[in-house]
Structure formats: structure tokens, C-alpha cells
């Protein structure tokens, strides 16, 4: 047992198995569930994280009104199919041959069908609206302090470039964080807004994905920001296709 083995961990994903058996004796970490090698300098894709989770043992308004095309993840957990890059495959099916199409964050965007269902491409989620309600505080948070703190959090904890945090809206007790990232804006090495939002969501729930880190301790000018409810809306580059019966 060497110091190198002690160092061989994945700081950004605790749902991994690591060993110094990579090229030239370098550390290599593999995601639970899929066995895929992961880059531990950045966030692991949501698809691989969901797969790992499923394999683990069980236990004058300033606020934005989500558009009619905004999706909420109502289906919850499922064991997804991921492509070789760790992204969601456009078509997902369960064990009973029920299939549906998903967007780049793995949220269903069509009615459920059978194995004949076609999903031609993985549609990108380019706009994410994170809607938070914070616990009562002595007074409202200062909007610009709150804005700066949330931008700092997304950069420093989730490695997301500040340019992708489009806006932070605040009407006590509701906070809305808008993340925007078009296909053309996302360069190699950039964290995906969907992955950042998922890590944030898990942090808020007290289920941090980071290795050996304490949970999220969010403070604005020393005042704790405690979230009591979270809703996340996903907007795709191409609107979803649901039949009318779902909308009634």
C-alpha cells in the first residue's frame, strides 16, 4: 500500500472505484454501475451518476415564469443507458420494453411508447431554471450579495464558467438561478449546465456527490441560506413532443 494509492481518489465523485492501474501507473477511477473511466478533475455526467445510484444498495414580477415547453423531472429515478462519452442515449427503455425519448439531462420529452419508438437525436437542454425557496430569515438577503455568492458557488464547487449563469432572480423567499448554455457556446472542457444543476440538486438535498467533503454550507455575508424546496425546469433547444391527452 503506497502513498500513490492513498492519493488515488476521485474528489468530484464518491461513487467510483479507483486504483493506480492506469497508463504508466497513473490513478484511474471508474464509475460504479457502468465501470466507465471518469475524469476526476471535473463533474461526472448525470447519466453515469444516475447509473451508479441505481447500482448502489437501496436505502411586475422579476421572477421568471417557466415557458409552456419547460419540463420538470416527474419520472424520478431510472437506470439509464449512457453512450461511450457518458451522455444519455436519446432513447431510454425499461425492463418491460416501454421506451421514451429524453433530453441531454435525461428528462423524458415524449410520451412513452414501445420498442418501435424512434428518437432521432439527443436534444440539448440549453436553459435550466432552478427555483428555490429559502427558509425564513431575519430579513431579505441583499440581491447583489446573493448573486455573487451563487455565481461563486457554481464556479468554485461545480466548475461552471460564470458566463453560463445567465441570471439570479430574487423575490423573498424565492430565488431563481438561470443557467444557459447553447451547443455552440459549450467548448471542450466546459462543465455541462445539466451536470452542474444535478450536483447542486443533490447538494441541496444533503446528498453530496463529492468525495469526503462536508455538505453544502451556503452563506450570504455570513447568514446561512437554507433551502426548503427546490424545483428545476428544463428547456430544450427543440420543444418536447407530448400528446394532447397528457396536457389535459
Amino acid at each position: 500500500h503506497t502513498a500513490a494509492q492513498d492519493n488515488c481518489t476521485c474528489p468530484t465523485n464518491k461513487m467510483t472505484v479507483c486504483s493506480p492501474d492506469g497508463p504508466g501507473g497513473r490513478c484511474q477511477c471508474r464509475a460504479l454501475g457502468s465501470g466507465m473511466a471518469v475524469d476526476c478533475s471535473t463533474l461526472t455526467s448525470k447519466c453515469l451518476l444516475l447509473k451508479a445510484r441505481m447500482s448502489a444498495p437501496k436505502n411586475a414580477r422579476t421572477l421568471v415564469r417557466p415557458s409552456e415547453h419547460a419540463l420538470v423531472d416527474n419520472d424520478g429515478l431510472y437506470d439509464p443507458d449512457c453512450d461511450p462519452e457518458g451522455r444519455f442515449k436519446a432513447r431510454q427503455c425499461n425492463q418491460t420494453s416501454v421506451c421514451w425519448c429524453v433530453n441531454s439531462v435525461g428528462v423524458r420529452r415524449t410520451d412513452k411508447g414501445d420498442l418501435s419508438l424512434r428518437c432521432d437525436e439527443l436534444v440539448r437542454t440549453h436553459h435550466i431554471l432552478i427555483d428555490l425557496r429559502h427558509r425564513p430569515t431575519a430579513g431579505a438577503f441583499n440581491h447583489s450579495d446573493l448573486d455573487a455568492e451563487l455565481r461563486r458557488l457554481f464556479r468554485e464547487r461545480y466548475r461552471l464558467h460564470p458566463k453560463f449563469v445567465a441570471a439570479v432572480h430574487y423575490e423573498q423567499p424565492t430565488i431563481q438561478i438561470e443557467l444557459r448554455q447553447n451547443t455552440s457556446q459549450k467548448a471542450a472542457g466546459d462543465v455541462d449546465i445539466g451536470d452542474a444543476a444535478y450536483y447542486f440538486e443533490r447538494d441541496i438535498k444533503g446528498e453530496s456527490l463529492f468525495q469526503g467533503r462536508g455538505g453544502l454550507d451556503l452563506r450570504v455575508r455570513g447568514e446561512p441560506l437554507q433551502v426548503e424546496r427546490t424545483l428545476i425546469y428544463y428547456l430544450d433547444e427543440i420543444p418536447p413532443k407530448f400528446s394532447m391527452k397528457r396536457l389535459t
Epitope: A3, C8, S41, E156
Partner: antibody, heavy 122, light 109 residues
Amino acid sequence: QQLEESGGGLVKPEGSLTLTCKGSGFDFSGTYWMWWVRQAPGKGLEWIACIYVGSGSSTYYASWAKGRFTISSTSSTAVTLQATSLTAADTATYFCARGATNNVFMNYFNLWGPGTLVTVSS
Amino acid sequence: FEMTQTPSSVSEPVGGTVTIKCQASEDISSNLGWYQQKPGQPPKLLIYGASTLASGVPSRFKGSGSGTEFTLTISDLECADAATYYCQTSYYIDDGVNGFGGGTEVVVK
């Protein structure tokens, strides 16, 4: 714990070279970033590239270095920097440095090599 | 993104105080390091996280600031403090920009 660069020397214009950074007293298999920084004679420090030496091998390059410089880590004890199409403007002391954290955006350099001088001249 | 360091050179007597400023063109929170470099040597880390003293660095060196404005203060100047000082951040490294300031030469009289 120390770092040492090698591979510097006199190179002809349009020539190429490979610089190597070796660590002793510690292993490159940790969860940190290794960096190359250069300093032209009498000038300031200029970042070239960095590589994550844990699981993944992510890299970042300075805009001006993309395409001409390549950082790599083929073993748990060495990081290399390959440079091509060298000009007199690339004459500098080249340092390798170890970043102190896993997060590339919150990095500072707590261990440096002594540097290796590269002179580009005909 | 740019790091602007001022002044480029400063001269103070032994026992005096030197203040070096570093300005980031965008908010970098507290992600700033300060380095000391003497001729023929590699830089040496003095301060990280804008204000935390690196191991073995005397308390005469003090870092402050956050956001876009940062300061390095060296008090009770000694002859050994004669060097060039650099500020540095990696906050916008993915933009391919140089995170080092231009340097400040400190001359101790």
C-alpha cells in the same frame, strides 16, 4: 519533495523540443494539476499549459500556446511539454510547477522546479 | 480577462512598508496568490486564497482583498525582501488567459 525540468538548450528557429518535468519525494498520481510556466529574459511569468495528473488527464492551454505546445503525462512520475515551430520569442526559462488543489480554477503553485533555459537561435 | 499589477517598481528603506496592488478585470472571489521571485530562482509562494500565509512565510507579509481588488503589504522591510513579486489567479484559466500580474520589483535601500 522537489521537481526538476530537463530538455532545455539551444534550438534552431522552426525547430522542436520536448521538456520533461520529474518529481521526487512524491508521486504524480495524486489529485492535482501540473503546470508549465515560462519567463523570457528580464520579463514576467507566463502560463503555458496544465494537466490533471489524477484520473482523467484534462488539459488547458494558454490561447497563444494551442496547437504549438502539447502537455502530456504518460507515467506517474513525469509530465512533458512538447513545443514545435519555435521562434526567438520562445526563448525563456521554462518552469514546471505543482498546483496545490484539485480544482483548476482555485489553483496556486506550492512547488516549483528550478527551470530549464531554452534558447531559440540560428 | 486581465491581471493588472501596480506599481511596476518601488523603492523603500529597510524597516519601511511596501504596498503592491493587483486588480482583476473580473470578479475572482478570493482566488489570488502572491509569489516572490529572486534572480536565478523560481518563484516562491507567499500567500494563497488572497490572505492565507503559505508555510514558513513571515507574518510581515500580509495579503488582503477579494473580488477584483487585492493588496500585498510587506512591513518591516528587510534586505532579503528585495525581489520581484507577482500576483496570480487561475479562476479564468479556461479562457486561455495568463493569470499572472506583470510583476513589481521591490528595491530595499
